[in-house]
């Protein structure tokens, strides 16, 4: 079936939430006065071999785990990243994107990344997917 | 019980190599970072560098940069600190220990007993 | 690398006294509304012993005649009523930026 606009529109609209939190997720941490950044470096992602499709989330479903534990030491008393809730509402967005009708096994690259690498590379797939939308 | 039990004391000569070790048990080693401390003799302590035994990533004091390596094995739960060549002025007390970080702490609060390095010719 | 200057470097006190230690940081260890400065306690030939974290919370198991305060620049571990057991170095410890570093040492002895 042919996307209609509505449709369109609806998918544009959770790329650009999950663009969101993926940035301020990225903001909160990717800050030299982080007292936490050096060991949160420490943490290794996998990224994906080829991102360009919604069906390509998969490969960030399966690292939002992880994700979660390194988030888990951003928190600060007037930083509220609260990252189970943060990632739920991302896993919550990707599985809706990604649709779950279709089965895609994730294939990953061989070199594993920091979080930011990480991060950055999700941040441009979402503005990439974006952009062909408009 | 949480620990962390380091190898024994060590006597070397300046230019040899060296690999001191640091068990953990009573928690899941892979899920925390392990840091190493200097003391030398009756001296502060200062902070050497940092692994994560999950994923091998690590860290260093810019002054050790070089000078040592960190690792770790996960599968027996283990970091290791070595010295490819060591010196007179590597003679310190080694101590490990485990990092917490959750929520808005950064403090060790597991460290091992302590590895004697002493380096003389 | 932030220095942290202890106060006094050593000192002799009775049991029951209440002890004062000070630690001055050369710039700020606050972030975002927390003060990563932590506090250790070290016997002869022992590894040190953390005692006071993000600067005044008490580790588990730490009698309570511990307590820390301050932020920013300037810290203080007070010892309520000194215990025989409490003869011993103090160290401050900054976990605020890298490389994380500790203050000289305080060492307590018997009067």
């Known amino acids: 079936m042919a996307p209609t606009s509505s449709s369109t529109k609806k998918t544009q609209l959770q790329l650009e939430h999950l663009l969101l939190d993926l940035q301020m997720i990225l903001n909160g941490i990717n800050n030299y006065k982080n007292p936490k950044l050096t060991r949160m470096l420490t943490f290794k992602f996998y990224m994906p071999k080829k991102a360009t499709e919604l069906k390509h989330l998969q490969c960030l479903e399966e690292e939002l785990k992880p994700l979660e534990e390194v988030l888990n030491l951003a928190q600060s008393k007037n930083f509220h990243l609260r990252p189970r809730d943060l990632i739920s509402n991302i896993n919550v967005i990707v599985l809706e994107l990604k649709g779950s009708e279709t089965t895609f096994m994730c294939e990953y690259a061989d070199e594993t990344a920091t979080i930011v690498e990480f991060l950055n590379r999700w941040i441009t797939f979402s503005q990439s997917i974006i952009s062909t939308l408009t | 019980e949480v620990q962390l039990v380091q190898s024994g004391a060590e006597v070397k000569k300046p230019g040899e190599s060296l690999k001191i070790s640091c068990k953990g048990s009573g928690y899941a080693f892979s899920n925390y970072l392990i840091e190493w401390v200097r003391q030398m003799p009756g001296k502060g302590l200062e902070w050497m560098g940092v692994?994560?035994?999950?994923?091998?990533?690590?860290n260093y004091n810019e002054k050790f940069k070089g000078q040592v390596t960190i690792s770790a094995d996960k599968s027996i739960s283990t970091a290791y600190l070595q010295w490819s060549s060591l010196k007179a002025s590597d003679t310190a007390m080694y101590y490990c220990?485990?990092?917490?970080?959750?929520?808005?702490?950064?403090?060790?609060?597991?460290w091992g007993q302590g590895t004697t390095v002493t380096v003389s010719s | 690398a932030i220095r942290l200057t202890q106060s006094p470097s050593s000192f002799s006190a009775s049991t029951g006294d209440r002890v004062t230690i000070t630690c001055k940081a050369s710039?700020?260890?606050?972030?975002?509304?927390?003060?990563?400065m932590n506090w250790y306690q070290q016997k002869p030939g022992k590894a040190p012993k953390l005692l006071i974290y993000t600067a005044s919370n008490l580790e588990s198991g730490v009698p309570s005649r511990f307590s820390g305060s301050g932020s920013g620049t300037d810290f203080t571990l007070t010892i309520s009523s000194l215990q025989s057991e409490d003869f011993a170095t103090y160290y401050c410890?900054?976990?605020?930026?890298?490389?994380?570093?500790f203050g000289g040492g305080t060492k307590v002895e018997i009067k």
């Open positions: 692994i994560n035994p999950g994923s091998g990533g690590t």
């Open positions: 410890q900054q976990s605020n930026e890298d490389p994380y570093t």
């Open positions: 220990a485990r990092w917490r970080g959750e929520g808005y702490y950064a403090y060790y609060d597991v």
């Open positions: 710039q700020s260890v606050d972030y975002q509304g927390d003060s990563y």
